[in-house]
Interface confidence: low
């Protein structure tokens, strides 16, 4: 006769391990019990359980409530077992030793590989500005048995190192991800991807980048001068600008203060109907976190009376 | 074959909790990741919370902080602490396992009803 094992038996931490054994004998043959081992214990071989054809079970002190035999139907010739919540502690060579009659013992050895599937970590690098250099956006850290691959998806351009440390029974890889900040790049996502076999599915952690800056300002209103005119109602001058995190306005007037009846709202200011008093150097203050921003106008009310006055003038001076 | 049976759902106001359970009809052990969809009406069936048989847990950015998810290798069951409800979580509950062989089996649940009132 012979044994059928397997040379390695692969679980995810957390799962059963079925530890196959199998006497594939001549007809007559009987297993009088199955002695299982783990093999690679410092101090010889360390018994895990013993199956007997009469006694049934046997556990070993150190494997109680973990070793079963897999359920009914059973084969008198099957001396494979269950591991029940395989733990990293677990891996290494297991031995089988099957005791028949009348053709005497055999022996076979497994591995028992027990993948740690990683739980992966995404952290922000520092805060991201327009203008900085080269910068670390986030890195990703994730540690398992074997060790993990991490790679990155994103439609951000940028450039990655990854780094591996080993300890005992597993590896911790960590990837980082930099790139030179700029406004298009606000609100992109950043993916970590951990693929590895204890995994259904790569793990995907997913960054937001936030990326700060302040765009040139610049004041809308002042396109057709002639609608500035004494008696106009309804005026009004508007600022634009964009940032992130947004941005405040604050209007003030160069050459004096704002004069009253002119409403500030955010990022407009509304006049009154026109009078010449309102002819002035009118300033856009813009600014977040990140910078400040200034646009000034010069707003000309014109006065048709005096303008009908000079061409008068003009007219008798021909 | 894997029997899915789901328990806990119902009418709870707005801000209060429910505790979903989900029996399995056999070893938990061997049902790697077991978790959580939800489908509300006229909309497609969405990811809640997963864990696996390691205890490492997943969550939807939508019920991450409020909702945890558990699970009793021992009693087979795994369990939906929903806290914090919102009337955007009525939906149908669908428990989930997937049982690897020599690929996926995903196993479902017939689904309970939670209905959150404003």
């Known amino acids: 006769g012979e044994l059928e094992t397997s040379d390695v038996v692969t679980v995810v931490l957390g799962q059963d391990a079925k530890l196959p054994c199998f006497y594939r004998g001549d007809s007559g043959e009987q297993v009088g019990q199955v002695a299982w081992a783990r093999a690679d214990a410092g101090e010889g071989a360390q018994e895990l359980a013993l199956l007997h054809s009469k006694y049934g079970l046997h556990v070993s002190p150190a494997y109680e409530g973990r070793v079963e035999q897999p359920p009914p139907p059973r084969n008198p010739l099957d001396g494979s077992v269950l591991l029940r919540n395989a733990v990293q502690a677990d891996e290494g060579e297991y031995e089988c030793r099957v005791s028949t009659f009348p053709a005497g013992s055999f022996q076979a050895r497994l591995r028992l590989r027990v993948l740690v599937p990683p739980l992966p970590s995404l952290n922000p690098g520092p805060a991201l500005e327009e203008g900085q250099g080269l910068t670390l956006a986030a890195s990703c850290t994730a540690e398992g048995s074997p060790a993990p691959s991490v790679t990155w998806d994103t439609e951000v351009k940028g450039t990655t190192s990854s780094r591996s440390f080993k300890h005992s029974r597993s590896a911790a890889v960590t990837s980082e991800f930099h790139l030179v900040p700029s406004r298009s790049m606000n609100g992109q996502p950043l993916t970590c991807v951990v693929s590895h076999p204890g995994l259904l599915q790569d793990q995907r952690i997913t960054h937001i980048l936030h990326v700060s800056f302040l765009a040139e300002a610049s004041v809308r209103g002042l396109e057709d001068q002639n609608l500035w005119h004494v008696g106009r109602e309804g005026a009004m001058l508007k600022c634009l600008s964009e940032g992130q995190p947004p941005p405040s306005y604050n209007w003030t007037r160069l050459d004096g203060p704002l004069p009253s009846g002119v409403r500030v709202d955010g990022d407009t200011l509304g006049f009154p109907p026109l009078t010449t008093e309102h002819s002035g150097i009118y300033v856009c203050h813009v600014s977040n976190e990140f910078s400040s921003r200034d646009s000034q106008v010069t707003v000309d009310v014109l006065d048709p009376q005096e303008d009908s006055g000079k061409q008068v003038d003009l007219v008798s001076a021909s | 074959e894997v029997q899915l049976v789901e328990s806990g759902g119902g009418l709870v106001q707005a801000g209060g909790s429910l505790r979903l359970s989900c029996a399995a009809s056999?070893?938990?052990?061997?049902?790697?990741?077991m978790g959580w969809y939800r489908q509300a009406p006229g909309k497609q069936r969405e990811y809640v919370a997963t864990i696996t048989s390691g205890g490492s847990t997943n969550y939807a950015d939508s019920v991450r902080g409020r909702f945890t998810i558990s699970r009793d290798n021992a009693e087979n069951t795994v369990y939906l602490q929903m806290d914090s409800l919102k009337p955007e979580d009525t939906a149908v509950y669908y428990c989930t396992a997937e049982l690897v062989r020599r690929g996926p089996t995903t196993y479902w649940g017939r689904g309970t009803q939670v209905t959150v009132s404003s």
């Open positions: 056999r070893s938990t052990f061997s049902l790697n990741i």
